[in-house]
């Protein structure tokens, strides 16, 4: 843990047992800000979360400390190390002087917290626009105007071919200067990200001559998800869903190539289904068979009534707020016509259960049901449209006999989860149950999928 971050562990000698953060409250960090203000948002930078917490539950509450003496609870939050947590605070409407961050994760590390005021806060009346200073190594000559006022472009004319230059940007606010930005290294005469030429040796995957994310070629000249880039300068196109199944998208694009089954495996789609909550608007039978390729997984959807129920089952008989208050559990059972030894369970989503006012990710609990009606738990899995379909590998305990799975049970707690298909992935031409039943003098025949007699030839 870094000196620059806070963690419940940070006050503890590394050779001692770290303190527990006991439920229900856990440990908390209290931070006070220099100026009390009416907030518009709160941003928190987290640098470490234990894997046990899976981003949800690590921060089990954040309280705003109001000047009036009130503590305003924002509830549990999902935190990630690669993205700061930003919470909009539209309705607070009163001055806040500090925050308390509660955690059940004794390893959680918090780097910084920022309270942003609403517009036209009196504190900002004296503010001047930010200025930027460019710093170079080797240093720029004294007469070069390296402080940028309203324009943000700096041109360096004093360069020698083959020389290595490093540049940093410093932000100036009044008389205060920021820490320098991360350095950019440039060898004069050689390529750089943004020159339209792909320098593979520098890790570039594309170069479209700009520094914009979201156009297929990122700020750092990396190809973005669902895009394919060709030529120099790069021309990028969004390939997912264009109707053409290209070789590179066979494994990733359901819309263009259908569901991908790796070699050596067989995917069996549900032949029957039963569900916990259904009516004419959300019948359970729609999850039978392969999912419709046209369905895109959507996130933060609060009205699932629009065209989803023809392709996917969701529990339409209960509203989201009600289900949360009543702590309702929803489930579906997908049955398969050929019981098999499962290698994986595949769950196709049309919505991932996220709610527009919330950062919480929904989880599903998955069980396999074998031909003897025994249940085999495959654990809890986080739902995300970014990871769709969800492929849950089945790990077999080799000290136990193999079993044939005939059904999958999926349970969850949000009626905003819509599932369009469930598949049982098994081994093609290979059945461990039959294999393990072969007697002495028999061998398993993949072609016949049974035990056959064999005789050793001398």
């Amino acid at each position: 843990s870094s000196v620059r971050t806070w963690s419940p562990n940070s006050a503890v000698n590394p050779h001692t047992v770290p303190p527990a953060c006991p439920e229900p409250q856990g440990c908390y960090l209290e931070l006070e800000f220099l100026y009390p203000l009416v907030p518009e948002s709160l941003t928190i930078w987290v640098t470490f979360v234990s894997t046990d917490w899976d981003s949800s539950g690590a921060v089990n509450d954040i309280k705003l400390l109001a000047v009036s003496g009130k503590n305003i609870s924002l509830g549990p939050q999902n935190v990630f190390c690669d993205v700061p947590l930003t919470i909009r605070l539209w309705d607070v409407g009163e001055e806040v002087y500090g925050i308390q961050i509660y955690t059940l994760d004794e390893h959680l590390e918090i780097d910084a917290a920022m309270l942003t005021s609403t517009a036209d806060t009196p504190l900002c009346l004296q503010c001047k626009p930010l200025k930027y200073k460019v710093v170079r190594d080797p240093p720029l000559q004294m007469d070069v105007a390296s402080i940028l006022h309203l324009n943000r472009k700096f041109v360096d004319m004093d360069l020698n071919l083959g020389s290595v230059y490093q540049y940093w940007v410093i932000t100036i606010s009044g008389t205060e200067e920021s820490e320098p930005s991360p350095a950019v290294t440039y060898i004069h005469g050689s390529g750089y990200c943004g020159d339209g030429i792909i320098q593979k040796d520098q890790g570039e995957q594309c170069d479209d001559m700009n520094k914009i994310n979201g156009d297929g070629c990122s700020l750092f000249c990396r190809q973005e998800v669902s895009f394919n880039c060709i030529d120099e300068p790069s021309r990028c196109y969004f390939h997912d869903g264009d109707g053409v199944c290209e070789e590179f998208e066979q494994k990733t694009s359901i819309k263009d190539c259908g569901v991908y089954t790796p070699q050596g495996f067989l995917d069996q789609w549900a032949s029957n289904a039963s569900v916990s909550h259904q009516d004419q608007q959300c019948p359970g039978w729609v999850i039978i068979g392969q999912p419709a390729a046209s369905q895109v997984c959507r996130t933060k959807v609060i009205d699932l009534s629009e065209g989803i129920s023809q392709h996917a089952w969701y529990p339409c008989t209960i509203s989201y707020p009600y289900s949360q208050l009543a702590q309702t559990t929803f489930w579906l059972r997908a049955y398969f016509s050929q019981p098999m030894v499962a290698a994986a369970v595949i769950v196709h989503l049309v919505t991932d259960g996220t709610y527009y006012g919330d950062q919480k990710q929904e989880t599903i609990s998955v069980q396999l049901l074998d031909t003897k009606d025994q249940s085999h738990d495959l654990g809890l899995h986080v739902l995300s449209c970014r990871n769709n379909p969800l492929i849950i590998p089945v790990v077999h305990d080799l000290s136990q006999p193999f079993y044939h799975s005939q059904a999958v049970r999926v349970s969850f707690s949000s009626p905003l989860v819509a599932i369009s298909g469930v598949a049982l992935r098994s081994f093609d031409n290979f059945d461990p149950v039959t294999l393990s039943s072969c007697q002495r003098g028999e061998t398993y025949s993949p072609a016949e999928q049974s035990c056959v007699h064999f005789a050793c030839e001398k």
Partner: antibody
Amino acid sequence: QVQLVQSGAEVKKPGASVKVSCKASGYTFTSYAMHWVRQAPGQRLEWMGWMNAGTGATKSSQKFQGRVTITRDTSASTAYMELSSLRSEDTAVYYCARGPSLETPTTFGMDVWGQGTTVTVSS
Amino acid sequence: DIQMTQSPSSVSASVGDRVTITCRASQGISRWLAWYQQKPGKAPKLLIYAASSLQSGVPSRFSGSGSGTDFTLTISSLQPEDFATYYCQQENAYPFTFGGGTKVEIK
């Protein structure tokens, strides 16, 4: 029959708190949700929050968060709503209303209402 | 917050008339809409829940329809006891919000 009976009218000074009670009868109190709704003179109805009367879990409108506290006493089949830091604009009729069954909901909406409690905030 | 807009804000009608009140949500709320009737000085009364389900004990002249963003409450044949203010309310997302009300007056 199913009914909700609320406490009497209150007059409060700005900055004070008010606690309104709502006694349920004719049904299993802990098997249903309980809403709190208010209506300022001549205004639309405004939802304040609700409670799972079985577990005590609550959710309130962000507009009131930090000012409203919803609690219950299961032995008395009574729900309470406390509003703190009162201001003149909190002058309204406050209603409790039964929400759906928490076990097997067959209806939604707020199907049984209390008679209302008038709270006047005035200096 | 989801805004609920009712129209008209008031309607004058006679006994026996068919009256239609509409309610529009600022974003989709699936079927999670309820209709209430309120008379002066009284608590509201639930008429319709889940957009179209008639609450037990409510006369069949009241009916509701709609899904997503557009909803309708219809009184097929107005009776003297139906003169009141009607509110719609969404319960699909927090905070639950009510429409501004439609006052049904005697012509």
